[in-house]
């Protein structure tokens, strides 16, 4: 028979961040190509990366019509060189992957701090909204426009000259922080879903971003300095 | 369809305890958060909270923090609302919802209602 | 808490009319992040549950007649309804779904006149 000759593909695991949504697999392929299905658990299959000689396929495109659904995939195996036949009735082998809910699963990229601005004792943090491959009609939705209230950010902020941090959360992009009058602080931020309970739940720290540098000034006269 | 179908009218005594359920379908359970909303017979809404069956994780309308209790068990997709000790402001009818598609969309779909009558 | 106070409490008005319902929160609904506006505007008839008509102060809700819009930034919000037809005759309801804890409006009562 045609696949005698092919093994089935192992480890299929899913590759989430923000909602980029990757199938991966092994073995790397000798004398065998891949085609992946993908399907929600009440609809139809339906077929990606046709014969492709890679160990990943990029499934996005399907995972953004509904990222609340709970999607499952399957790999098949084909010798290399296939050419489909309608008169083959032998299916190939092939492996299913996990479940995998988007809304759920998919990690949560790293925070950028896009501006901080001091007037006086306060700090007004601002976090980057990214943007998502998720659509409303043809416009595509940022991080807070899929998860709403269920995303806040955690901001860690110290004295430069001193390493006790403090925190503070938020539901929305923006902090509002009081300082001490003359010192330089620096600043980083954790996206978080609460209600998620395992691993996924926390994004990693954004890049540190220091008063007196770049993205922002310690200004007493109440100036804002953007980052642009 | 989704569709949100809640349990049948309950006449209670005060102090005793009630359970409503809201079994849900044509969509997928653990996703979505199940709002409770209390409307007392000519008033208006108010929202007691919200749980998200994936994880159970809760929020709770401090108004409501102590004797309302939400629950859900995915293996039949259904959400409950229990209340303790009951008392006659509580007569009113509680509406499950679901939340929106979207952050902060609204509830987009709403069971029948349940009307709980406190009275000895 | 967010207080939602909608006005008026009661209206009298005719088929055909265009009618005007507000809506005030006492702390803005505008997410700087994303600049929308979390505010959703219901119908209520009597008997029934509610039925979500505008969130994000003003996307309709799949199905809503074009008839319905919301409009409205940070504080102020409206509901139009641009020619009253006899199934709108309801209550409408506005509510803060910003932040917890979610808050409803008090509801305008659509009768008529």
């Known amino acids: 028979s045609g696949t005698t000759n092919t093994v089935a593909a192992y480890n299929l695991t899913w590759k989430s961040t923000n909602f980029k949504t990757i199938l991966e697999w092994e073995p790397k392929p000798i004398n065998q190509v891949y085609t992946v299905q993908i399907s929600t658990k009440s609809g139809d299959w339906k077929s990606k990366c046709f014969y492709t000689a890679d160990t990943e396929c990029d499934l996005t495109d399907e995972i953004v019509k509904d990222v609340k659904q709970t999607y499952l995939a399957r790999v098949f195996s084909y010798p290399a060189g296939h050419v489909e036949s309608t008169g083959s009735t032998e299916e190939p082998p092939y492996e299913n992957s996990p479940e995998f809910t988007p809304y759920l699963e998919t990690n949560l990229g790293q925070p950028t701090i896009q501006s901080f601005e001091q007037v006086g004792t306060k700090v007004n943090v601002t976090v980057q909204d990214e943007w998502t491959l998720v659509r409303r009609n043809d416009t595509f939705l940022s991080l807070r426009d899929v998860f709403g209230k269920d995303l806040i950010y955690t901001l860690y902020y110290w004295k430069s000259s001193s390493s006790g941090k403090k925190t503070a959360k938020t539901n929305t992009n923006e902090f509002l922080i009081d300082v001490d009058k003359g010192e330089n602080y620096c600043f980083s931020v954790q996206a978080v879903i609460p209600s998620r309970r395992t691993a996924n739940r926390k994004s990693t720290d954004s890049p540190v971003e220091c008063m007196g540098h770049e993205k922002g000034e310690s200004r007493e006269t109440g100036h804002h300095h953007h980052h642009h | 369809e989704v569709q949100l179908v809640q349990s049948g009218s309950e006449l209670k005594k005060p102090g005793a305890s009630v359970k409503v359920s809201c079994k849900a379908s044509?969509?997928?359970?653990?996703?979505?958060?199940i709002e409770w909303v209390k409307q007392r017979p000519g008033q208006g809404l108010e929202w007691m909270g919200d749980?998200?069956?994936?994880?159970?994780?809760?929020n709770y309308n401090e108004n409501f923090k102590g004797r309302a209790t939400f629950s859900a068990d995915t293996s039949v997709s259904t959400a409950y609302l229990q209340i303790s000790s009951l008392k006659a402001e509580d007569t009113a009818v509680y509406y499950c919802?679901?939340?929106?598609?979207?952050?902060?969309?609204?509830?987009?779909?709403w069971g029948q209602g349940t009307l709980v009558t406190v009275s000895s | 808490d967010i207080q939602m106070t909608q006005s008026p409490s009661s209206l009298s008005a005719s088929v055909g009319d265009r009618v005007t319902i507000t809506c005030k929160s006492s702390?803005?609904?505008?997410?700087?992040?994303?600049?929308?506006?979390?505010l959703t505007w219901y119908q209520q008839k009597p008997g029934k549950a509610p039925k979500l008509l505008i969130y994000?102060?003003?996307t309709r809700e799949e199905g809503v007649p074009s008839r319905f819009s919301g409009s409205g930034s940070g504080t102020d919000f409206t509901l139009t309804i641009s020619s009253l037809q006899p199934e709108d005759f309801a209550t409408y309801y506005c509510q803060n779904d910003y932040t917890y804890p979610l808050t409803f409006g008090q509801g305008t009562k659509l009768e008529i006149k």
């Open positions: 919802a679901r939340s929106g598609y979207y952050g902060n969309s609204g509830f987009a779909y």
């Open positions: 994000w102060a003003s």
């Open positions: 749980i998200l069956p994936y994880s159970g994780s809760t």
């Open positions: 702390q803005s609904l505008l997410s700087s992040s994303n600049q929308k506006n979390y």
């Open positions: 044509g969509y997928t359970f653990i996703t979505y958060w």
